[in-house]
């Protein structure tokens, strides 16, 4: 028995950031799971991992240097990515594994989401000074 995953076919990352929602045919509430986002047709690059342990705080990390965060819904995980580069335009696949309670479950491969990273507009208006941070 496999979990089905739905993703948007395409997203555009403006300002080098994007939110990708992975919707599952499975309720993740009170489950131990590992949700991950993979880059490339062969899913060779694991972009981000969101580890959930029942109703506790999500643990988020990337072994490949991506700046990411995750939000959990009952039947979804949304990945938030920052500081994307134009050359990271690619197809991204959601993956889900449920470790507990048994039985172990994972997903049928989804259709993926093409994330198109638009370059930052680097020409400031001459009327306004550069931004200032507190």
């Amino acid at each position: 028995n496999k979990i089905l995953v739905k993703q948007s076919p395409m997203l555009v990352a403006y300002d080098n950031a994007v939110n990708l929602s992975c919707k599952y045919s499975y309720n993740l509430f009170s489950r131990e799971f590992r949700a991950s986002l993979h880059k490339g047709l062969d899913s060779a690059v694991e972009v981000c991992v969101v580890y959930g342990n029942y109703s506790q705080q999500l643990q988020v990390y990337s072994k490949t240097g991506f700046n990411c965060d995750g939000k959990l819904g009952n039947e979804s995980v949304t990945f938030y990515l920052q500081n994307l580069y134009v050359n990271q335009t690619d197809i991204y696949f959601c993956k889900i594994e449920v470790m507990y309670p048994p039985p172990y479950l994972d997903n049928e491969k989804s259709n993926g989401t093409i994330i198109h990273v638009k370059g930052k507009h680097l020409c400031p208006s001459p009327l306004f000074p550069g931004p200032s941070k507190p």
Partner: antibody
Amino acid sequence: EVQLVESGGGLVQPGGSLRLSCAAFGFTFSNYWMHWVRQAPGKGLVWVSRINSDGSSASFADSVRGRFTISRDNAKNTLYLQLNSLRAEDTAVYYCARADSSSWYLFDNWGQGTLVTVSS
Amino acid sequence: EIVLTQSPATLSLSPGERATLSCRASQSVSSYLAWYQQKPGQAPRLLIYDASNRATGIPARFSGSGSGTDFTLTISSLEPEDFAVYYCQQRSNWPPTFGQGTKVEIK
């Protein structure tokens, strides 16, 4: 004026535990990601952990993952770092830092730090 | 993770002189680089973000430049309060990392 005040540091034996606190003043705490950064005596800065604005997600440096936990109480405007299974190499000044509102890992305000010494 | 290498380790200068500090990244960080100042016994303070933007309240004598792998922090004319340790930090890749610091000391 933004102010971050750490407390809870001290001397602890290897294998012991400690809980650090960071009280926040002068800004809407619940709107910001928060971080812990440490500095061993005479050494440079090393990022330790972060928590998002509502406390629902966290990340940790490899060196502390599984030993440290981060949490926050937005009602009390306070950030916490629970340090377990402490090692000599965890000896450092621990700073809490606020992330810039638009950049998760840009640290725009820092506390004065609290010293953790792990020694037998 | 990205390694940031700062040079020189120590810079001995007199007040009024120009200070040039370097930070080199092990791979491109685009313009996602910040500079912090730390005085003895004090917390770090954000000076420059996104390679060249001054943080609020930072004097104009501090300027940053560079992109990709090579970055520079310049203090055009050193004031007595500028003698401190300076750190660069990247936020391009996770985890965020800092350089080992450059100490600017009075000659």
